[in-house]
Interface confidence: medium
């Protein structure tokens, strides 16, 4: 018998369903147990920019420690404000700095991602280490990446359509699921049904779906049934703020008594069949009907309470952004550029508009130095000699002051330029890990210790080692020591920085060939990066040091195969 119930989209104020899933449009998970670097690749597609994204990395400790470094490659198609959480994880992040803006300083090593197509990005990532996971996500709001979790049977990660990332990756789409509703014809009363249908996924085993149900009505006002239908391997953990009738497939339990499993029923696996089930249970209204991919957490917010159902003519749109300006986010968008003895601040109007901010003024600390409106952006420029610039031996500092229409206080942000003329970079070679006695001689088979310094020191910037190699001339070739801020090979170790923040590493040099070169050049590329703010202020320098090489040792790591 056909059930007459014309499912129509329900307005977001009547019902909204958000969910977290490990199903991705394309993806792969592979095992790389012996890799020094755990590589993860995320391809993120956003239908409209700019978007906000919360990205959390979680480490599962092995033997009480987190042994491996992690490279996360982030490929995005439009502007993203990224809120990154990766506490205690030795993370290297490769991304496009013109598209990704951090809400707060990432506090991790970063590398510019070349503008390659997807296949080449995967190849580029694979050159750095075996890929543990890769996924393509459409309009994510938040992503949780669990490290050290890869359960894949593959030893090589190749993107395949409609994949389940298991425990490795869970994500929440920005667009809530389409919620539909209808009146069940010929049924009297006010009983409402909430139907959730979880579609089969590529699951490798039993799954528990947590269903959070929040109905905003007084407890006495509600007569409702919750119908949960899914594949046989799914059980349900229900967290509801109201008592209601429960009708599920598989088994279910309640969050308040998680150990008490209750057997469910055999339910039809078609929308028509589920509507029939709701009718059989005496529901007069289907307040929400939702079909979802296999999810780990589903949240249903509804406010129908058995009242008159309101449907909306159009499908539910993405949750609208706040129409209140976030000054903190706004200030993070100010880009600082330093060139030709001048500081330039740039604020793109497109991003400002997205944050619903109305700017009434952008100045330096000296309010007479005002930004000019250049159509698509505000530009504020001043020579180092004016507008209240504070010039020190290593740095030029000022303050960006932004007046926002809705805020009674101007927003302030410290801005800095490096005084490159006064900065000097030095490479130091030491024979012991105490870094006390400098030397210019290395001995094959003996560990050498290297430290890079900048003077005078610059507290607002971070000094980082991007790459180092040892050039041993035509005889000895080149030994790569550090690449992409990671140690190359077993004979190189990145060490903790000095108390002043100077980067340090050690290396061990061996030769299999003769003649052994008598001299070499140690060459390191270093970067000064702002501890807060944008990557556009990065300064790169290459520093050289001539070394003498003494007494051979014919075992161990080699400079040339």
């Amino acid at each position: 018998e056909t059930v007459h119930c014309d499912l129509q989209p329900v307005g977001p104020e009547r019902g909204e369903v958000t969910y977290t899933t490990s199903q991705v449009s394309k993806g792969c998970v592979a095992q790389a147990p012996n890799a020094i670097l755990e590589v993860h690749v995320l391809f993120l597609e956003f239908p409209t920019g700019p978007s906000q994204l919360e990205l959390t990395l979680q480490a599962s400790k092995q033997n009480g420690t987190w042994p491996r470094e992690v490279l996360l490659v982030l490929s995005v198609n439009s502007s993203v404000f990224l809120h990154l959480q990766a506490l205690g994880i030795p993370l290297h992040l490769a991304y496009n700095s013109s598209l990704v803006t951090f809400q707060e300083p990432p506090g991790v090593n970063t590398t510019e991602l070349p503008s390659f197509p997807k296949t080449q990005i995967l190849e580029w990532a694979a050159e750095r280490g075996p890929i543990t996971s890769a996924a393509e996500l459409n309009d994510p709001q938040s992503i949780l990446l669990r490290l050290g979790q890869a359960q894949g049977s593959l030893s090589f990660c190749m993107l395949e359509a409609s994949q389940d990332m298991g425990r490795t990756l869970e994500w929440r789409p920005r667009t809530p699921a389409l919620v539909r509703g209808c009146h069940l014809e010929g049924v009297a009363g006010h009983k409402e049904a909430h139907i959730l249908r979880v579609l089969p996924g590529h699951s490798a085993g039993p799954r528990t779906v947590t269903v959070k149900v929040e109905l905003s009505c007084a407890p006495g006002d509600l007569d409702a049934v919750l119908i949960l239908q899914g594949p046989p391997y799914v059980s349900w953990l229900i967290d509801a703020n109201h008592n209601m009738q429960i009708w599920t497939t598989g088994e279910y339990s309640f969050k308040i008594f998680p150990e008490k499993n209750i057997r469910g029923f055999k339910l039809p696996d078609t929308p028509q069949g589920l509507l029939g089930e709701a009718r059989m249970l005496n529901a007069s209204i289907v307040a929400s009907f939702v079909e979802l991919p296999l999810a780990s957490i589903v949240s249903l917010h509804a406010s129908s309470c058995g009242g008159r159902l309101q449907t909306s003519p159009a499908p539910i749109q993405t949750t609208p952004p706040k129409d209140t300006c976030s000054p903190e986010l706004l200030m993070s968008l100010i880009q600082t550029k330093c060139a030709d003895d001048a500081m330039t601040l740039v604020l793109k109007k497109e991003l400002v508009a997205h944050l619903k901010c109305t700017i009434t003024g952008l100045t330096f600390w000296d309010p007479s130095c005002e930004a000019e409106d250049r159509g698509d952006k505000f530009v504020l420029r001043s020579a180092y000699s004016s507008c209240g610039m504070q010039v020190s031996a290593s740095m030029i500092s000022n303050e960006a002051v932004v007046n926002i229409l809705s805020s009674s206080s101007p927003q302030r942000k410290k801005v800095h330029c490096l005084n490159m003329d006064s900065l000097s970079f030095q490479l130091g070679l030491y024979l012991s890990p105490h870094f006390l006695q400098a030397s210019n001689t290395i001995e094959p088979g003996q560990q050498s210790f290297v430290q890079v310094r900048v003077s005078p020191s610059v507290s607002e910037f971070l000094l980082q080692l991007d790459s180092c190699h040892l050039d041993l001339g035509p005889e000895g070739g080149t030994v790569e020591l550090i690449q992409g801020r990671a140690a190359k090979g077993n004979c190189v170790s990145l060490l903790s920085p000095s108390p002043e923040g100077d980067p340090r590493f050690s290396f061990l040099l061996h030769f299999y060939t003769v003649p052994i070169p008598k001299t070499g050049t140690l060459s390191c590329t270093v970067a000064l990066r702002p501890k807060t703010g944008s990557q556009d202020q990065e300064v790169h320098r290459t520093v050289f040091m001539r070394l003498n090489i003494i007494s051979p040792d014919l075992s161990g790591c080699t400079s040339k195969g």
Epitope: K322, D323, T324, S326, L405, S409, R412
Partner: antibody
Framework: QVQLVESGGGVVQPGRSLRLSCAAS????????MHWVRQAPGKGLEWVAV????????YYADSVKGRFTISRDNSKNTLYLQMNSLRAEDTAVYYC?????????WGQGTLVTVSS | SYELTQPPSVSVSPGQTARITCSGD??????AYWYQQKSGQAPVLVIY???KRPSGIPERFSGSSSGTMATLTISGAQVEDEADYSC???????????FGGGTKLTVL
Amino acid sequence: QVQLVESGGGVVQPGRSLRLSCAASGFTFSSYGMHWVRQAPGKGLEWVAVIWYDGSNKYYADSVKGRFTISRDNSKNTLYLQMNSLRAEDTAVYYCVRDYSSGWYWGQGTLVTVSS
Amino acid sequence: SYELTQPPSVSVSPGQTARITCSGDALPKKYAYWYQQKSGQAPVLVIYEDSKRPSGIPERFSGSSSGTMATLTISGAQVEDEADYSCYSIDSSVNHVVFGGGTKLTVL
């Protein structure tokens, strides 16, 4: 450190006036918008008024509009609330509050009692 | 002008999770801010812009906002968290500030 010290509270008869002051220190007073917020005994917080950092804009809750005036003297680092035509329902602890995007900083408050 | 509604009281045992809600028609579009006020003391900000935590506030305090409801969550509530908690929001269209009625959190 940031300090906001309210003064001028006390007992006053209905219909009379009172002027509250708030002395600010530990920050650049002229860079911040300031609010007055009150809390009647045993009740929740109620926003009263706001003044822009430079005094250019002032806004009031409907319950005090036309009776209360917020002002500031940036040279003296002081915020004021002139309260006229006081009513019994104006009895409350009045807090002076510094505005900023990442939240407000509150003084300890001064008690105003309107009673005959 | 709109209103913000909070439950008058919430009780939890030490170590449990406390959730305090604040509902208002404007919250899908406005940020929620949360204050803690201990007896006889001035209020202290614990969450701003829905979910951001000021420095110095313990990590057990978190905030979220979905639809017309903002929620302050205290994971593993402690006896010292016993206080009144108020939400507020700024109606920037009229430059008014709206407070919720406050919720008394009891940690038994």
